[in-house]
Amino acid sequence: IVLRPSRVHNSEENTMRALTLKDILNGTFSYKTFFPNWISGQEYLHQSADNNIVLYNIETGQSYTILSNRTMKSVNASNYGLSPDRQFVYLESDYSKLWRYSYTATYYIYDLSNGEFVRGNELPRPIQYLCWSPVGSKLAYVYQNNIYLKQRPGDPPFQITFNGRENKIFNGIPDWVYEEEMLATKYALWWSPNGKFLAYAEFNDTDIPVIAYSYYGDEQYPRTINIPYPKAGAKNPVVRIFIIDTTYPAYVGPQEVPVPAMIASSDYYFSWLTWVTDERVCLQWLKRVQNVSVLSICDFREDWQTWDCPKTQEHIEESRTGWAGGFFVSTPVFSYDAISYYKIFSDKDGYKHIHYIKDTVENAIQITSGKWEAINIFRVTQDSLFYSSNEFEEYPGRRNIYRISIGSYPPSKKCVTCHLRKERCQYYTASFSDYAKYYALVCYGPGIPISTLHDGRTDQEIKILEENKELENALKNIQLPKEEIKKLEVDEITLWYKMILPPQFDRSKKYPLLIQVYGGPCSQSVRSVFAVNWISYLASKEGMVIALVDGRGTAFQGDKLLYAVYRKLGVYEVEDQITAVRKFIEMGFIDEKRIAIWGWSYGGYVSSLALASGTGLFKCGIAVAPVSSWEYYASVYTERFMGLPTKDDNLEHYKNSTVMARAEYFRNVDYLLIHGTADDNVHFQNSAQIAKALVNAQVDFQAMWYSDQNHGLSGLSTNHLYTHMTHFLKQCFSLSD
């Protein structure tokens, strides 16, 4: 059990107060993390509270300012990037968000040696992506879907691509679906380790159907937003990978990297690129039916100035029980011999573990094993491999950092974080300096987050980087809810849940229950992390019990649970939420006449299906920006889990799993449906179709739209949204205002 101390003592009770909705909306109890911007083995940069860019040297304990807030302010910079030769800094301003990761900005280059901005051959605006080479101060940037190269910041640019065209051809940046569902980045270009070569992707969206929606704005006529967006079964982008020599870019121009034959024989995706050396690159490809992935290691042929990808350097990863990988196919971490690598994939028992591949995947050496999962490989050095897993004490919702000594035989394993601040910290990530000389640990909870700096050799803590003292003090007079993480065993399935209980929780009383659900494939909601959010308020002030349940389809507990939902989305995720609710009722403290469910995105889909399950368990529920039919969602995501919406594949389940098909079943529940009209991700179409089906079935429901808002419902919409949902729930639970 993880109990977050509420710090309530009888003598203090009258000085303590409950959380308010205002606290949540104002972000009063938000926390800070500290991720060093490493520039060497022992130095990092950090933006100070007053906006100076400061260089810290761990070994001397000294720091000095390299760029003043005055310089930052002179161009309204909100971000910066130091060139690896430490001569220049790019300053980023006029940030303009596009999709989840992408944005455009204006860039200025500041010369540190001369204390002035670089004049002449200034960068165009707005730029879609810009980055320094890994060595020196070459610049690559994307402007109007084309890639440009500068040898030095003050030099004229060399144009690498010429065919870039809005919504048609994307060079060096992903299109919508690759950004959101495959790369999870705003960029699609990669420098080789010493900056000799630049690899980039070209996405051709010419034949992709376009989603169009109105953006109302302030004008007399609304604008129409058009996005090439392949829905399930539609035509996909065509991807090609090119590499150019940045020293002599005009010599032979960009050279295309060949696609493995077994991949190229049908529709496919490019999934990631990893440079190994300046003359060796590793590409990962995936069949459109995403159960076969190929990792291809390619070498530069000096004589032909081309890239050769021999079949002997192709490694196939295939899943027979589900899709390849977890959410994404994992990426390799190469060792110092520049050919062998470490990679996370399923072992014979169906748990994701680290494997060492020297020649073939069949001969892979398993590095970690057990009924838990390795989650991320942070760094491989000559003698150590650092990774995270949820092994410790068998809590899948924890993350600890481990070190395996690979320089010695047999390799020994040490948990770096397990016993550091055991009550406070059970969910970590890490950030390593060059050669893992030092590293920062960022602990996200369950206690108040804390960031610390450590010696990479001894693991000794050097200093606290951020401990959120102000937050700790602010929470001293707050009655926080209690949290517990436990599990239910039902029909050979383990259902982990987090329960958030009112501060003065009494098992002999009855409380209204709110289920918060996400439930998407390879997600995890039950995590040992700190949060003071809307559901904390509902427990603290409104006396609700809130529960989160990780059912079938969720991650980090083995393939049996993960792949249970393969080709059957919308069935087991819903069943498991219902099963958990029944178990919670059996615990005796839930008022079974006051049970609600709510979720956002995939969670909106699950909450809608749960409300329409006909069980009579739920009095009311909320769906925010729900998917309503898998035919409306993106191809890359949907087909990974559902296959194709064709007669000879899985059309039947596509049709059976819609929210609309269950319109009749909403008659006996109170349903609140919410969506942003400018949602580029889960299109407003989804909620429009639910509403139409409910109207056609003459079923009453409540709805709220947010004009010109996307999938995140940010800004003032957030306040309106949570206020509106609070009123809805309080009315449903007969709680006074």
Epitope: S40, G41, Q42, E59, T65, I66, S68, S113, K437
Partner: nanobody
């Protein structure tokens, strides 16, 4: 008072060699990354070599293979060994923190290197 004193410059024929020294006083230089910079007449100051506290070095392509930066932490001194000098290496050479500290008035006087053809 923090000071940087560069020395070792002079007139040399193309293809010749020079060794520059920079003596640093003040705690900020102890253990921090240091660099050699140069400024030719009418040009901007530019980096020619950098060295971190653990001895990792960096050189731009224009001097790679010809110049070598080193440091003697006991003497608080950094050096620049310049071989195969070319006329385009003619400039005033300075040492400083790498990257330089802002508002750092004490760039030294520098040392003049002239390479004749």
């Amino acid at each position: 008072q923090v000071q940087l004193q560069e020395s070792g410059g002079g007139l040399v024929r193309a293809g010749g060699s020079l060794r520059l020294s920079c003596a640093a006083s003040g705690s900020i230089f102890v253990g921090n990354a240091m660099g050699w910079y140069r400024q030719a007449l009418g040009n901007q100051r530019e980096l020619v070599a950098g060295i971190t506290s653990d001895g990792t070095t960096y050189y731009p392509d224009s001097v790679k293979g010809r110049f070598t930066i080193s440091r003697d932490n006991d003497k608080n001194t950094i050096y620049l060994q310049m071989n195969s000098l070319k006329p385009e290496d003619t400039a005033v050479y300075y040492c400083n923190l790498w990257p330089p500290r802002i508002g750092f008035a004490s760039w030294g006087q520098g040392t003049q290197v002239t390479v004749s053809s």
